[in-house]
Interface confidence: low
């Protein structure tokens, strides 16, 4: 069937359209195009005779039409009046006619739209604004965008006039946005420039900052006021109702108690004509004096004296606070506060009570601290320590002993040998000693302030022969795979080499064995039962050597998984069942039995005479080592056949 296709169907003014013919019959004489839906000679556009290939314009020919041999018609430079139907009349060779009609629509290319507004400065919660998209264009669709988004759903937004007009009722400050309109028709779409809606609002109730309402005499008062407003608000300050200045900030230096009162900020919007005020009450407090601490005893003696610290000056209706070592007071029966907290008493002072101590006076604004006070606690002397710790020396070396005792004031020292006073020094030095220098060396420490005196006595042996050493241990019963043991070879002797043997052999190489303290200490990490050996230490110098008696390490271990013997699991009825359980363990474990889960006796051997098939079941041996806290068990199945 003969058909006409319009390409495109919607044509923009000034463009071109092709009326494309489909299913053109064979054996044609010619064809003609007509404007309209029927063949009308008055409205013929063009005719075409195939034989002569001659095209003849008709009355409706505008000069913009071109006919093709395949009967298609091209119309150029389209105008609005070209809209409508076009009919093709085909004349076949047998003079039988055929007709087909096609159509297209012409639309203008849209101009860039613009937005007009009926109110350039609407007031919040009062005015409405109507935006209109210009120009008005026939057959155009109107769209609106807010901040480049499609219109939100809102009862305050209304479209009218074929969507050409957007009305915002009762505008708010949140309607301050970018508005655009768009026009569309089948051949074009154009968007307007943005229009920013400038909503007048405010002022809101102003906020005064900072929020602080209490000040101390002598400080500066600096208040700032802010109110949300468009255009920005104009500000005025009033103090106790009296106008001060028209600024956003109010600054009063070096305030006094007289500056206390009500401070009002007024915000004014000249466009909306609205005023809002906020009031804050400022209180200025007088500056209290800086506190200080007095003490009833400036040099208390440890464990004897008490000290009373008092916070000055005395002020009525004031809270007193105390700190020790920059911390609040610890709970201690030796610390007592008076009823008004003004006096802190330290009962039976110790050297740790030196402080520093601070007191504070609390007012409405802050706490004023005193300067810190440190107590000079007299103590000691403690028992003096004599160093070095060596007790054995070889003849010919120099003996240099030093004494120290904790004391305040520092102790005075005296040395005695075998009870005879030697010198009043902290150090004692004797060169090139001999066996005759062996004896009791006493250090005496004296505290002149407390009158106390303490002594320490050390036995010094000068001998070419080393003493027989001994081994001390930090753990006499270590647990396997858990504990470490440190053996130390005593005594500590000067210029001495320390040696170790295990079961008569030199130390094996093992990451679990470590020598330290000049080889004087042997540490066994993560002991095992194999470490239960005889350990011997030896000391030697250039002239002598000696060995300790052996110390055997008692390693607690187990219990290991027990073994039930005999291994038989099948018995004849009437036989005796005699099961023995054994588990490697130190100390020996406690044994118990269960038959089919039921507890039996606490023995290593389980004996049942003349067993029957009723004795079939599971026989479990449980072992427990109370020293290691570990348990173990094994289960054996017994079958008795009739």
């Amino acid at each position: 069937k003969l058909t006409i296709e319009s390409t495109p169907f919607n044509v923009a003014e000034g463009k071109e359209v092709l009326l494309l013919v489909h299913n053109l019959p064979q054996h044609l004489f010619g064809y003609s195009w007509y404007k309209g839906e029927r063949v009308d000679g008055n409205r013929q556009i063009i005719g075409y005779v195939i034989g002569t290939q001659q095209a003849t314009p008709g009355p409706a020919y505008s000069g913009r039409e071109i006919i093709y041999p395949n009967a298609s018609l091209l119309i150029q430079n389209i105008i609005q009046n070209d809209t409508g139907f076009y009919t093709l009349h085909v004349i076949k060779s047998d003079l039988v006619n055929e007709e087909a009609t096609g159509q297209f629509r012409v639309y203008p290319e849209l101009p860039k739209p613009s937005i007009s507004s009926n109110n350039s400065k609407p007031v919040e919660d009062k005015d409405a604004v109507a935006f209109t998209c210009e120009p008005e264009t026939q057959d155009a669709t109107y769209l609106w965008w807010v901040n480049n988004q499609s219109l939100p759903v809102s009862p305050r937004l209304q479209l009218s006039n074929g969507n050409r007009t957007l009305t915002l009722f009762n505008v708010t400050r949140n309607d301050t946005a970018s508005y655009k309109c768009e026009t569309q028709n089948p051949v074009s779409a154009r968007r307007s420039d943005s229009v920013i809606l400038n909503v007048l609002y405010g002022p809101d109730a102003p906020t005064i900052s900072p929020l602080n309402t209490s000040y101390r005499s002598g400080e500066n008062l600096n208040l700032s006021c802010h109110a949300a407003s468009n255009p920005p608000a104009q500000y005025s300050w009033f103090v106790n109702g009296t106008f001060q200045q028209s600024t956003q900030e109010l600054f009063i230096p070096n305030i006094t108690v007289n500056n206390s009162g009500s401070y009002t900020c007024q915000a004014h919007n000249s466009d909306t004509g609205l005023n809002r005020t906020t009031v804050t009450t400022i209180t200025v407090y007088a500056e209290p004096p800086k506190p200080f601490i007095t003490s009833n005893n400036s040099n208390p003696v440890e464990d004897e004296d008490a000290v009373a610290l008092t916070c000055e000056p005395e002020i009525q209706n004031t809270t007193y606070l105390w700190w020790v070592n920059n911390q609040s007071l610890p709970v201690s029966p030796r610390l007592q506060l008076s009823n008004d907290n003004r006096t802190l008493t330290l009962l039976s002072v110790t050297r740790n009570d030196v402080g520093p101590y601070e007191c504070g006076i609390q007012n409405e604004l802050s706490v004023d601290h005193s300067d810190p006070v440190i107590l000079n606690v007299l103590y000691g002397p403690d028992d003096p320590t004599i160093s070095p710790s060596y007790t054995y020396y070889r003849p010919g070396v120099n003996l240099s002993l030093s004494c120290h005792a904790a004391s305040n004031p520092p102790a005075q020292y005296s040395w005695l040998i075998d009870g005879n006073i030697q010198q009043h020094t902290q150090e004692l030095f004797i060169s090139n000693i001999t066996e005759k220098n062996s004896g009791l060396y006493t250090c005496q420490a004296n505290n002149s302030a407390s009158g106390h005196s303490r002594t320490t006595v050390k036995t010094i042996t000068v001998s070419a022969e080393l003493p027989k050493p001994s081994i001390s241990s930090n753990n006499s019963k270590p647990v396997e795979d858990k504990d470490a043991v440190a053996f130390t070879c005593e005594p500590e002797a000067q210029n001495t080499t320390y040696l170790w043997w295990v079961n008569g052999q030199s130390l094996p190489v093992s990451p679990r064995l470590q020598l330290s303290n000049g080889n004087r200490t042997l540490t066994l990490f993560n002991v095992t039962r194999n470490d239960a050996r005889a350990y011997v230490c030896g000391i030697q110098n250039s002239v002598s050597a000696n060995r300790s008696d052996p110390v055997t390490l008692d390693v607690l271990y187990g219990p290991d998984t027990p073994i039930i013997s005999p291994p038989d699991s099948s018995y004849l009825s009437g036989a005796n069942l005699n099961l023995s359980c054994h588990s490697a363990s130190n100390p020996s474990p406690q044994y118990s039995w269960r038959i089919n889960g039921i507890p039996q006796q606490h023995t290593q051997v389980l004996f049942i005479a003349k067993i029957t098939p009723n004795n079939n079941g599971t026989y479990a041996c449980f072992v427990s080592n109370l020293a290691t806290g570990r348990n173990n068990s094994i289960v054996k199945s017994i079958t008795v056949s009739a």
Partner: antibody, heavy 120, light 105 residues
Amino acid sequence: QVQLQESGPGLVRPSQTLSLTCTVSGFTISSGYSWHWVRQPPGRGLEWIGYIQYSGITNYNPSLKSRVTMLVDTSKNQFSLRLSSVTAADTAVYYCAREDYDYHWYFDVWGQGTTVTVSS
Amino acid sequence: DIQLTQSPSSLSASVGDRVTITCSTSSSVSYMHWYQQKPGKAPKLLIYSTSNLASGVPSRFSGSGSGTDFTFTISSLQPEDIATYYCHQWSSYPTFGQGTKLEIK
């Protein structure tokens, strides 16, 4: 923090002795621990060589024991490795490492490694 | 000698994947340690004594196991985890696994 730094020649001739030193900073060797050498041939895994303790106690990998000597110098806070009669198979990156123990022994601090090539 | 066998010898995984490496021993050991080695760098301790996280190591790394079978896991693979991972035990003397090379898909 504890740091280990290996040093020594990068090229050793076959049959000669390889000598490397590890300098410890941020920790005193004589305070304890064991001090190890580990090597890694090109493109291969890690092989433990041995360790020395500050007291001079040593323990070597059985496969290298006959050729390895380790020494410690607590005054310089250093320990060293000597590997004699080297061949091309001894070409590797050599690391020194500190051993820590939490009842179990592992290497918690390593040097950045030094490359040793055995070639004529 | 106790032999350590790691599997797989290499693996490729995506960021965010859970990655598991196993280490089998020729006889029973009481613990296992794990190290990470990035190209050209020294090994770094990640896990000690089977399951303890070394200081400063992210919590996505973990370890478990006992006897002869031990496992090392990265719960959510990160790009910076590209490295070779070694298991390590110390019985008579220290030995290491042959290593597992981890790559990002």
